[in-house]
Amino acid sequence: TPLGPKWPEPVFGRLASPGFPGEYANDQERRWTLTAPPGYRLRLYFTHFDLELSHLCEYDFVKLSSGAKVLATLCGQESTDTERAPGKDTFYSLGSSLDITFRSDYSNEKPFTGFEAFYAAEDIDECQVAPGEAPTCDHHCHNHLGGFYCSCRAGYVLHRNKRTCSALCSGQVFTQRSGELSSPEYPRPYPKLSSCTYSISLEEGFSVILDFVESFDVETHPETLCPYDFLKIQTDREEHGPFCGKTLPHRIETKSNTVTITFVTDESGDHTGWKIHYTSTAQPCPYPMAPPNGHVSPVQAKYILKDSFSIFCETGYELLQGHLPLKSFTAVCQKDGSWDRPMPACSIVDCGPPDDLPSGRVEYITGPGVTTYKAVIQYSCEETFYTMKVNDGKYVCEADGFWTSSKGEKSLPVCEPVCGLSARTTGGRIYGGQKAKPGDFPWQVLILGGTTAAGALLYDNWVLTAAHAVYEQKHDASALDIRMGTLKRLSPHYTQAWSEAVFIHEGYTHDAGFDNDIALIKLNNKVVINSNITPICLPRKEAESFMRTDDIGTASGWGLTQRGFLARNLMYVDIPIVDHQKCTAAYEKPPYPRGSVTANMLCAGLESGGKDSCRGDSGGALVFLDSETERWFVGGIVSWGSMNCGEAGQYGVYTKVINYIPWIENIISDF
């Protein structure tokens, strides 16, 4: 029997009946075996076919076989009901080999010319399957020349049979208190040749409950218990299953906090699998009863292990555990059925005793010592000497535990010293002056620091003075010894103040005239205001109306008196304001340089002399009574004058304070 070409030779060629294209002889038998490479098949078609027609092709025929299977037995020229001629058909081997057998019997009624056929090897597309046939691959089939391979969707792995996709369904751990798990692809058929392991692992104290839901369909057998596919449930106490078939298994109360579910499938079958809804239970904790003025959240029918609740207090109440305030409270149910924390109390917010108000006092309005939520207190300043700054002094204990003003401020009100109070209400009759009485000049400050000078108290922690009086101490403020609250220069019964900083006007030039002869001293502590220590007022915008020519101002100090010594007792003098041009002219004669008197100065004194401020009075205030407010204000600062105090035709020269209000306000607000 002639053999066709063998792989790896090129697999294509021509076959023909003996003697073709002439007629074939009787009693011929010819066999060709064609072999293609693995993964290939053979394609065959006829270009000529002319054989004797006989019933079921019993006489002459061409038979095509592939392995044990006969593909076709051909005869005649055209197909009939019982016989087949190839016509234009193409024939394919089932595998990689094709057998062709030609036979003629002992006679022919007429001559027949036989056949001519062509063949070639071609790739088999293994991925193409006939309808109703099992697919080549479980998931994805990939054809290639000479073969194919299978691959799997994510979550699956190719079985060692290279066709089946086994599910990657092990190692899943469920830790939530409830959940759902199901066979892979549920409710579609589960994969073959898979072994799935699921773990439910809850905290100790929980007990897992398994409920099979919706449908259950696992391949079974009528006689043997789950021999093919099965589901098993294992706890540390016992094993449940195996389960298979179509009946939903009953609820399983595992009494265990850990459960392992195993699902094993074989290579066959088409079943939808199973779905489990699991829950858990634990020993319940006592039902939490909210404390008075509080509520529990969330509200549940029961609370078991790991359940928690929080307590929220009503507005104006705060959480207290014993005596300790809590920002929040959450209790957690433990495995033994007890709460991990005792119930707190909702105690009314207590703002506590209100802070003392410097230079003021506080009064309980709601009731003596009542400091709880919505309680009201009233701050007030010490009468006469202090007044409350932009605040009505009424504070309420709010829910946040802070005393809060009607404007929502949590800071204390401020008691500002009342300025310009004096025991002296009218001008009386220093050089040519008279002794001050207690309370006459409570703003008077004695400044010692190399020389004796004076100043005037502003607010409760600033002193206004002359730049020339403190110039030497501008870099050593602490060297200034500041005394107030006494009339006697040599009395130990003074209130001591100390300088924190000295601010000299930037326009002042030492030893080059007295323009801008003004300075501020910041005290390192506030002084207590009383009848002997009271600040002077700064001039209002309207103050110039009380400082016109011939208006009376009062200067005070411990400076030189007519006897030529510093005064032991505070002295004062009432002096009229002098016309500015007149004063300028008085100081244009030698030895005074031109322009000695500037617009930043004012002059006061008598043309006849005898009343003046003098050395040692420098920096002190020349004060005026504001008849509208009935308060004294500083109009001038003792600055300079003639060498001989109280000289006729010469006047005391004072720094004009009203020109410096912005400078004073800026310094005080900045520092």
């Epitope: 006697k488 040599l490 009395s491 130990p492 019964h493 001591q496």
Partner: antibody, heavy 121, light 106 residues
Framework: QVQLVQSGAEVKKPGASVKVSCKAS????????MHWLRQAPGQGLEWIGD????????HYIEKFKDRATLTIDKSSSTAYMELSSLRSEDTAVYYC??????????????WGQGTLVTVSS | DIQLTQSPSSLSASVGDRVTITCSAS?????MYWYQQKPGKAPKLLIY???NLASGVPSRFSGSGSGTDNTLTISSLQPEDFATYYC?????????FGQGTKVEIK
């Protein structure tokens, strides 16, 4: 030289009064304050009060406000301290001391020799 | 009232020793004054305004400090220095004294 000479020791019964004198010399009496202090046996120093010798203005600490009286006699440059309603705890050495007038005015640069006042029934 | 606490309350030292006495105030004081008192005698001013030596006082005595802590130092103790030492303040009314420090011969 500057000195303060105090009167001699006194023994008084409870409820009585005592008046201790302090004569100043060697300085201008009216330029200074005169302070009075006391020292109980084995104890520290306690301030009573002071008097301005120029105008007799007095200051007492709260404890002695009602029982102590400070006076001066400018003509003899003498200061006096009278303590009334004596009790046994008033037994002490009483000192007069001159107040400084050079710096803070708040310390004592010259002291009397002290007067022992014993209160005993 | 401002309380002044002296330490130590007493000390034993030898001639030539350096001795330091501290005076702690319950609140800040600007100036401290120191006095020496011998048995049966009136106190004598040693230091005024914290660090200034009073007239006639030997230079072995010195004062220092600020705020609440002040110190009296005797650089080389002499036989005549065995006495009780007091600090005094009047930054705040009323003036007060420390309880005293007794310096004895070792």
């Amino acid at each position: 030289q500057v000195q303060l000479v105090q009167s001699g020791a006194e023994v008084k019964k409870p409820g009585a009064s005592v008046k201790v004198s302090c004569k100043a010399s060697g300085y201008t009496f009216t330029n200074h304050h005169m302070h009075w202090l006391r020292q109980a046996p084995g104890q520290g120093l306690e301030w009573i009060g002071d008097i301005d010798a120029s105008d007799s203005e007095t200051h007492y600490i709260e404890k002695f406000k009602d029982r102590a009286t400070l006076t001066i006699d400018k003509s003899s440059s003498t200061a006096y301290m009278e303590l009334s309603s004596l009790r046994s705890e008033d037994t002490a050495v009483y000192y007069c001391a001159r107040g400084d007038i050079t710096t803070t005015l708040r310390y004592f640069d010259v002291w009397g020799q002290g007067t022992l006042v014993t209160v005993s029934s | 009232d401002i309380q002044l606490t002296q330490s130590p309350s007493s000390l034993s030292a030898s001639v030539g020793d350096r001795v330091t006495i501290t005076c702690s105030a319950s609140s800040s004081v600007r100036y401290m004054y120191w006095y020496q008192q011998k048995p049966g005698k009136a106190p004598k001013l040693l230091i005024y305004d914290t660090s200034n030596l009073a007239s006639g006082v030997p230079s072995r005595f010195s004062g220092s400090g600020s705020g609440t802590d002040n110190t009296l130092t005797i650089s080389s103790l002499q036989p005549e220095d065995f006495a009780t030492y007091y600090c005094q303040q009047w930054s705040s009314y009323p003036l007060t004294f420390g309880q005293g420090t007794k310096v004895e011969i070792k």
